[in-house]
Interface confidence: low
């Protein structure tokens, strides 16, 4: 699409480096969809305009990371500077690209576990050795009885993803391996998706 | 950021126990693992354990299984670590310290240990 | 337990030049694009300071001179221009699996 970050860039670039500063601060704290990861707070602060630019588009892809920067400025006051990335949003046709594709499966640069927690939900049956596995590691001993108590996978599943949020990428890159070992045929599926 | 206050020093006989303390500022230390970490004078850093204040769920380092016991005090946002069996090669800065995403990024200023009759 | 290995074990760089130290792991620490290796810095009687995560992170509030790169076993860190304050002992440390571990240190002085 191109045309999008070109306009990202255009809007970073005229702002002054307070605005920059309060742009990065907001974006912390932003509401973001589901799906989506935040970019790291000790890299985002060290960025330049370029720099932001790239990673917006490389953690939200072109369409979602126009919207959230048009999100951001308009929190921070700037309506003339959104109103021209609306322009820009609407004639490149991102409405209908972000509208046309679920959260979860643009989500390329977040954690497979992120990506796919619908289908992991509604698809991990052996959910016992899941936790077993994950237990000691990543999940203390009540968040593991917690799980361990629900009654179907299902909302075993929707248990553990409710820990997800306060996880690092080691805990993740468990919980993926977890999954390889017990369901790797499900695991298959979802990376070719 | 979290502050992690510990005591300065502390100085005990051969064979007997310490419990060394580190108390975290704000309201967020239910939230965080709390890792422990040993350096010997001049030397290295080693890994010990970590609890997680939420419920006191563990884990240690296998070197220190039977050596270290990690604690916490939820009321008092206080982190405990009591070593037994104190021996010299016990002697070293006691530090803890909180991984608030991916690494640990609040230290505390260590509480030197030193055994000797 | 993997081993991490630093080299060297010190090193003197004039002002304003480049430092260099490596950190080799006994197997990979890299998982699914992320490379689990962390890098601090410690001065006499301080606790360690983060700068660096993830291999190339940079801690909020650390100067950009400092820089991070590697994956799978190799890392390095790279400090550019080297100022006096940057004399300290640098570890890198892995949060692959249980235990984690430190490397040996390496000591930089500033000539």
């Known amino acids: 699409m191109g045309r999008a970050r070109d306009a990202i860039l255009d809007a970073l670039e005229n702002l002054s480096g307070d605005e920059l500063k309060k742009f990065k601060m907001k974006l912390l704290t932003v509401q973001l969809r589901e799906g989506y990861g935040r970019i790291p707070r000790g890299a985002l602060l060290q960025m330049d305009a370029i720099d932001l630019t790239d990673k917006l588009v490389s953690y939200y892809l072109e369409s979602y990371g126009l919207e959230l920067t048009m999100t951001v400025l308009r929190d921070m006051g700037l309506q003339e500077l959104a109103e021209q990335l609306q322009t820009t949003k609407e004639e490149s046709g991102a409405v209908a690209a972000a509208a046309s594709v679920p959260a979860q499966s643009t989500a390329r640069t977040g954690h497979f576990v992120d990506q796919h927690r619908q289908a992991l939900i509604a698809r991990v049956t052996e959910v016992d050795g899941v936790l077993d596995a994950l237990h000691g590691s990543v999940l203390t001993e009540g968040q593991y009885q917690a799980v361990r108590a629900e009654t179907t996978s299902q909302d075993k599943m929707r248990k553990l993803f409710s820990f997800v949020p306060s996880w690092n990428l080691t805990c993740k890159d468990s919980l993926l391996q977890a999954l390889k070992e017990i369901h790797p045929y499900l695991v298959m599926d979802l990376e070719q998706s | 950021r979290v502050q992690l206050q510990q005591a300065g020093a502390e100085l005990v006989k051969p064979g007997a126990s310490v419990k060394v303390s580190c108390k975290a500022s704000g309201n967020t230390f239910n939230n965080y693992w709390i890792y422990w970490v040993k350096q010997r004078p001049g030397q290295g850093l080693e890994w010990i354990g970590r609890i997680h204040p939420s419920d006191s769920g563990t884990n240690y380092n296998q070197k220190f299984e039977g050596k270290a016991t990690l604690t916490v005090d939820k009321s008092s946002g206080t982190a405990y670590m009591q070593l037994s069996s104190l021996t010299a090669e016990d002697s070293a800065v006691y530090y803890c310290?909180?991984?608030?995403?991916?690494?640990?990024?609040?230290w505390g200023h260590g509480t030197s240990v030193t055994v000797s009759s | 337990d993997i081993v991490l290995t630093q080299s060297p074990a010190s090193l003197a760089v004039s002002l304003g030049q480049r430092a260099t130290i490596s950190c080799r792991a006994s197997k990979s620490v890299s998982s699914f694009g992320y490379n689990y290796i962390h890098w601090y810095l410690q001065k006499p009687g301080q606790p360690p300071k983060l700068l660096i995560y993830l291999a190339s992170d940079l801690e909020s509030g650390v100067p950009a001179r400092f820089s991070g790169s590697g994956s799978g076993t190799g890392f390095t860190l790279n400090i550019h221009p080297v100022e006096e304050e940057d004399a300290a002992t640098y570890y890198c440390q892995h949060s692959r699996e249980f235990p984690w571990t430190f490397g040996g240190g390496t000591k930089l002085e500033i000539k």
């Open positions: 310290a909180l991984l608030s995403l991916y690494a640990m990024d609040s």
